[in-house]
Interface confidence: medium
């Protein structure tokens, strides 16, 4: 589930180059890696550089969101002549270098994936010592995290004129379709709100008017699975309250 594409200028996949005598700086990453929430995924990144036989100090860095300025999620440093890249930063302990930077490989493993990890990641290598040089992937690799639906909130809320409405919010990727069922409803898609800005995996469906007492069930479904949750509406007749 990685989609790689040919970069016609270099005949390499997502290869970014910087001209230089002899060998040149370039980085090879796939445009996208897909994995399911909970799994581990490998973000491949290999590079070439113009500094033949460089064995001085180096630092390998991965950042998220945007190149050059995005927050670092992983960083390690290797001393002169050492093949061991000592981890200095691994966000939440979930990032681990698999590649050997001395062999031009910065490939990273991300474990226990969550929907929040669905971002673009950028690899970077820095040389220090006799040679001072650095290079970073500009396009990066997009980590696409998929997940079966999970209902994160279901509730009944008061609305004007002593009526009640129900809200169901679910997350998943692809964003799940929501349906309500309940007394005198049959199966209803109700009013589904599009994923919210900044919350691309969340979908909310509203039942604007609950006209009958009983059990209301929200079902969320996508290609990876389905989930459901229920609320109960019981109004104290003759009073203006409700038990849910």
């Amino acid at each position: 589930f990685v989609r790689t594409k040919i970069d016609t200028t270099e005949n390499l996949l997502n290869t970014e180059v910087h001209s230089s005598p002899a060998q040149r700086w370039s980085m090879q990453v796939p445009p996208e890696v897909s994995a399911e929430a909970g799994d581990a995924a490998v973000l491949p990144c290999t590079f070439t550089h113009p500094h033949r036989h460089y064995d001085g100090p180096l630092t390998a860095i991965w950042r998220a969101g945007e190149p050059y300025a995005g927050p670092q999620v992983f960083r390690c440093a290797a001393a002169r002549g050492s093949e061991l890249c000592q981890t200095a930063l691994s966000l939440h302990g979930r990032f681990r270098l698999l590649g050997n930077p001395r062999r031009n490989d910065l490939s990273l493993r991300v474990e226990r994936l969550a929907l929040a990890d669905d971002r673009r990641y950028f690899c970077r290598v820095e040389f220090a010592g006799d040679v001072h040089d650095r290079y970073e992937s500009r396009h990066g690799v997009r980590l696409h995290v998929t997940a079966a639906p999970r209902i994160v909130n279901i509730s009944v809320l008061p609305s004007p004129a002593h009526a009640f409405r129900a809200l169901c919010t679910a997350e998943g990727e692809p964003p799940p379709a929501l349906a309500w069922s309940g007394p005198a409803l049959g199966n209803s898609l109700a009013a589904v709100r599009s994923p919210r800005e900044g919350h691309g995996h969340l979908v909310t469906a509203e039942l604007p008017a609950l006209t009958h007492d009983g059990r209301y069930t929200c079902t969320a479904a996508n290609s990876l699975g389905r989930s459901e949750a229920s609320v109960y509406l019981f109004r104290f007749h003759g009073a203006s309250g409700a038990s849910t």
Partner: antibody, heavy 123, light 107 residues
Amino acid sequence: QVQLQESGPGLVKPSETLSLTCTVSGFSLSNYGVHWVRQPPGKGLEWIVLIWSDGSTTYNSALKSRVTISKDTSKNQVSLKLSSVTAADTAVYYCARHPYDDYSGYYYTMDYWGQGTLVTVSS
Amino acid sequence: DIQMTQSPSSLSASVGDRVTITCKASDHINNWLAWYQQKPGKAPKLLISGATSLETGVPSRFSGSGSGTDYTLTISSLQPEDVATYYCQQYWSSPLTFGGGTKVEIK
């Protein structure tokens, strides 16, 4: 020397759960991961899942909804469960060692394989 | 998913012949390619990883080459013990995928 041995029932009924165990020797599951791969009779190889040395998992998404993998490092065993089987799941099932995780450059190759066990799904 | 297409699906050659098997990936795999040998009734055996690196103990008549999407396994001088089915496998992306196999026989 490095060895992997698959075991489990040779016959499973449709809709039931297939359970297989891979017992390893000559290396530690603390340092190496294990893949499961299957091969229907007369056909090619299909990768199922990898459990890394630290217990993390990477699944083939086409099978993930039916697959469970776990390991018991102290017993040198990795187990595979495949639920809701059909005749299409009839195959030789192999476990294979995943080389040491760090710095190997061999993220997903399989350097030693078990001999495989044939599982037939039939009523 | 990255599809791996092997050709030919089968071949027959004489002892001592040079044999070439090709594997084409549907996308670039950056040389993250392995070759396996599977003899009848046996498990696969890793021959080559990284497109070109011969595993320890594998005879030097086996070699791998290629880059980008096109890769080749060559047996420089076919021996009777090389009768087997050969599979390529990419590991640039998950799910890991194998070629359909090439069955090699002796004439």
